[in-house]
């Protein structure tokens, strides 16, 4: 039986050390490249094998990056966000939002706040 899909949102501070080939991930998003409807945030689209992010293991594809070294990523053009990462130095602190999909009970069970009925 399928359940209703909900999301658990958590935030985490991730400190990465830039490796020989950099930080090792790709991003999408920005005010000029909205990846998620009505959200101009910056999202991780790819983690590269054996890169710094992959070896650390905490950053995941689909994570939203809220800040880099304390600098907010809100309302940035896509290329400005890319440049921010490229100029972030050797030790890079990322504030990220993970969105974990959770199963919330079987269909037919109406929890509080369920709009049906």
């Amino acid at each position: 039986m399928n359940g209703r899909v909900d999301y658990l949102v958590t935030e985490e501070e991730i400190n990465l050390t830039r490796g020989p080939s950099g930080l090792g991930f790709n991003i999408v998003g920005g005010t000029d490249q909205q990846y998620v409807s009505n959200d101009s945030g910056i999202y991780v689209s790819r983690i590269k094998e054996n890169g710094a992010a992959a070896l650390d293991g905490r950053l995941q594809e689909g994570d939203k990056i809220l800040s880099v070294n304390g600098q907010d990523l809100k309302n940035l053009l896509h290329q400005d966000a890319v440049d921010l990462f490229r100029n972030a130095g050797y030790a890079v602190s990322l504030r990220v939002q993970h969105r974990l999909q959770v199963q919330n009970g079987p269909i037919g069970h109406r929890g509080e706040g369920d709009p049906s009925g």
């Epitope: 080939s21 950099g22 930080l23 090792g24 991930f25 790709n26 991003i27 999408v28 000029d32 490249q33 990846y35 991780v44 689209s45 790819r46 590269k48 896509h78 290329q79 890319v82 990462f85 490229r86």
Partner: nanobody
């Protein structure tokens, strides 16, 4: 999963022109960074050109600079390679490649490992 289909290859005389196309599936085409590579018989796959997500940033291999032009039409989910002044040494199978998003590291667009998806290729023969 992203599907890539190249077309436009063929046989052309030296000095002639061809225009290759690469159509990509997926609703997020405008977030892809894309490239063209080529492989001649018995040789390694070689970088030809790269284009950023919006089309404003382009990079070329020295061997094709001034002769080839990469472009894209995000409304049509299509990338192009206009090849002019073709030479016999341009003979190869031409592949389009896609990376999802922009790398946050300095441009490594000539590295095939930077790309996530590849087309089947289209043959270009210059006689």
């Amino acid at each position: 999963q992203v599907q890539l289909v190249e077309s436009g290859g063929g046989l052309v005389q030296a000095g002639g022109s061809l225009r290759l196309s690469c159509v990509a599936s997926g609703r997020t085409f405008s977030t892809y960074t894309m490239g063209w590579f080529r492989q001649a018989p018995g040789k390694e796959r070689e970088f030809v050109a790269h284009i950023g997500w919006s089309g404003s940033s382009t990079y070329y291999a020295d061997s094709v600079k001034g002769r080839f032009t990469i472009s894209r039409d995000n409304a049509k989910n299509t990338m192009y390679l206009q090849m002019n002044s073709l030479k016999p040494e341009d003979t190869a199978v031409y592949y389009c490649a896609v990376a999802i998003g922009s790398p946050v590291d300095s441009n490594r667009h000539s590295d095939p490992l930077e790309y996530d998806y590849w087309g089947q290729g289209t043959q270009v023969t210059v006689s």
